[in-house]
């Protein structure tokens, strides 16, 4: 049952294909899993800074540090990817800056370009110097936790030396790792001391141990693989937009709704209205009017411009965005002041972003 009554015969989903709008693209910060990421909030004169991720308040925790205008993420994982915002609250206004964080694993990209440097990992020893296995490049083994998006390729390396040349075998969760243990098997490149798994799936999660041994000894190293599922998502709306506004009678005002969607978003601007003196229909649902929606006859749907406003235009304006996956909406209030009263500080009304959701 719909949660509102539509005043005019405006269909929620236009039958004509919407034009593909240029959806706002914020700055993108890229990090590899395990790395630390530091971002400075690029806003001036901030009395108080608050942070959000995908529209949800971000507080400090064991991996997230918030110091002044800096956000630090320690040991980033793909789950840290998303749309971030910092909002600077000042005495008279607030401003928000948005950026994307993309945590992807360069060595799990599916290509083996970095294998070109593998030759130096294959160390030849003087035949007289017998030696137990040892690691030749511990830097390549420092990152033990690998959080990788599903369908990517993963490579674990254990560059080693010894005399005679050690052999390498792999265990999964402490047991011998056999080809038949995963669909598509895996590759071992002995000359690069590497294990390669293509197109990882959630069942590949676990601990992978390389055991390097010769007749003089044995060493081992364990990696933990976490497979992060990637899937399409419903629209994400930039936090804090649309923003509350005020103007005088006869003035003009603009509401802006910034949308992030990897599928065609359908944008609607909706307002609560009265019909026959009532805000609610006989079913108890509010009357809503679609003022603008994305479609072939609509210019930039992310902006709702109101000209020559009257007192009747005051009220709540909802930016509602849908794609084939789901919906998101946020709202703002318009305060219309009498002509003799200049607009001062914006009227502080808390608008619920979940009103229609």
């Amino acid at each position: 049952r719909p949660s509102f009554s539509l005043v005019e015969d405006t269909t929620l989903e236009p039958e004509e294909p919407p034009t593909k709008y240029q959806i706002s693209q914020p700055e993108v910060y890229v990090a590899a899993p395990g790395e630390s990421l530091e971002v400075r909030c690029l806003l001036k004169d901030a009395a108080v800074i608050s942070w959000t991720k995908d529209g949800v308040h971000l507080g400090p925790n064991n991996r997230t540090v918030l110091i002044g205008e800096y956000l630090q993420i320690k040991g980033a994982t793909p789950r840290d990817s998303g749309l971030y915002a910092c909002t600077a609250s000042r005495t008279v206004d607030s401003e928000t800056w948005y950026f994307m964080v993309n945590v992807t694993d360069a060595i799990s990209s599916g290509d083996d370009e970095d294998d070109t440097d593998g030759a130096e990992d294959f160390v030849s020893e003087n035949s007289n110097n017998k030696r137990a296995p040892y690691w030749t490049n511990t830097e390549k083994m420092e990152k033990r936790l690998h959080a990788v998006p599903a369908a990517n390729t993963v490579k674990f390396r254990c560059p080693a030396g010894g005399n005679p040349m050690p052999t390498m075998r792999w265990l999964k969760n402490g047991k011998e790792f056999k080809q038949e243990h995963r669909i598509g098997g895996y590759k071992v490149r002995n000359q690069h001391w590497s294990l390669i798994m293509e197109s990882v799936v959630p069942s590949d999660k676990g601990n992978y141990t390389c055991v390097v041994e010769n007749e003089y000894g044995s060493i081992n190293h364990t990696y933990h693989l976490d497979v992060v599922e990637r899937s399409p998502h419903r629209p994400i709306l930039q936090a804090g937009l649309p923003a509350n506004a005020s103007t005088v009678v006869g003035g003009d005002v603009e509401f802006v709704c910034k949308v992030y969607s990897d599928a065609q978003p359908h944008i609607q601007w909706i307002k609560h209205v009265e019909k026959n003196g009532s805000k609610y229909g006989p079913d108890g649902l509010p009357y809503l009017k679609v003022l603008k929606h994305s479609g072939i006859n609509s210019s930039n749907a992310e902006v709702l411009a109101l000209f020559n406003v009257t007192e009747a235009d005051a009220g709540e304006y909802i930016c509602k965005v849908s794609n084939y996956i789901g919906q998101a909406n946020q709202s703002a209030w318009l305060t219309v002041l009498p002509k003799q009263q200049a607009p001062g500080r914006e009227k502080e009304i808390t608008a619920s972003p979940d009103y229609l959701e």
Epitope: P2, P17, H233, R234, Q264, S322, Y324, Q327
Partner: antibody, heavy 114, light 107 residues
Framework: QVQLVQSGAEVKKPGSSVKVSCKAS????????VHWVRQAPGQGLEWIGS????????SYNQNYRGRATITADKSTSTAYMELSSLRSEDTAVYYC???????WGQGTLVTVSS | DIQMTQSPSSLSASVGDRVTITCRGS??????IAWYQQKPGKAPKLLIY???YRYSGVPSRFSGSGSGTDFTFTISSLQPEDIATYYC?????????FGQGTKLEIK
């Protein structure tokens, strides 16, 4: 894990109605559309419509507007698709799918026969 | 409504072959297309979304490309378990229409 479990097969008379249910689990039901898709025997896939359970917004394929009604019950995380004025050509497997089409129900065979 | 024209309607290939299926939209749909695999008696399975993104757990031999009106789905090296019917679907605007399907058989 995400699951969509549909009601069992139905045999209906022409002119009658059928209501197929789709119970969701393993995800936030109100955060995704639920789509309904049908497939006649030996034929391709056809989108019937969808609903956003959180607010009941629904959208329909014009071919089914007026005959199909899609509803959702948030309290039980269940979506429903009712098809009225059934005719023999409505004999098909009816599927529900989560908004991203990544998860589908097992399908419900509706046979319309006199 | 946006029509999705899929070709070929059927094709026969050998294990290890590279297989390509195309889909053309009657209107531009940017990259809003998905590809599904359906085996007899089973629900469709999402392989590719937004034209080129492989869904979680889908083997890397499956890929998609294209933008606007013309799209391609490729199996780089056909495996016996890939025998199925494949569908494209536009998810740009309602009604979300499917192509008529491509039935893939092993020679």
């Amino acid at each position: 894990q995400v699951q969509l479990v549909q009601s069992g097969a139905e045999v209906k008379k022409p002119g009658s109605s059928v209501k197929v249910s789709c119970k969701a689990s393993g995800y936030i039901f109100t955060s995704y559309n639920v789509h309904w898709v049908r497939q006649a025997p030996g034929q391709g896939l056809e989108w019937i419509g969808s609903i956003y359970p959180d607010n009941g917004d629904s959208s329909y394929n014009q071919n089914y507007r007026g005959r199909a009604t899609i509803t959702a019950d948030k309290s039980t995380s269940t979506a429903y698709m009712e098809l009225s004025s059934l005719r023999s050509e409505d004999t098909a497997v009816y599927y529900c799918a989560r908004g991203d089409f990544a998860y589908w129900g097992q399908g419900t065979l509706v046979t319309v026969s006199s | 409504d946006i029509q999705m024209t899929q070709s070929p309607s059927s094709l026969s290939a050998s294990v290890g072959d590279r297989v390509t299926i195309t889909c053309r939209g009657s209107n531009g749909i940017s990259n809003d297309i998905a590809w599904y695999q359906q085996k007899p008696g089973k629900a469709p399975k999402l392989l590719i979304y937004s034209a080129s993104y492989r869904y979680s757990g889908v083997p890397s031999r499956f890929s998609g490309s294209g933008s606007g009106t013309d799209f391609t789905f490729t199996i780089s090296s056909l495996q016996p378990e890939d025998i199925a019917t494949y569908y494209c679907q536009q998810h740009s605007t309602t009604p979300y229409t499917f192509g008529q399907g491509t039935k893939l058989e092993i020679k």
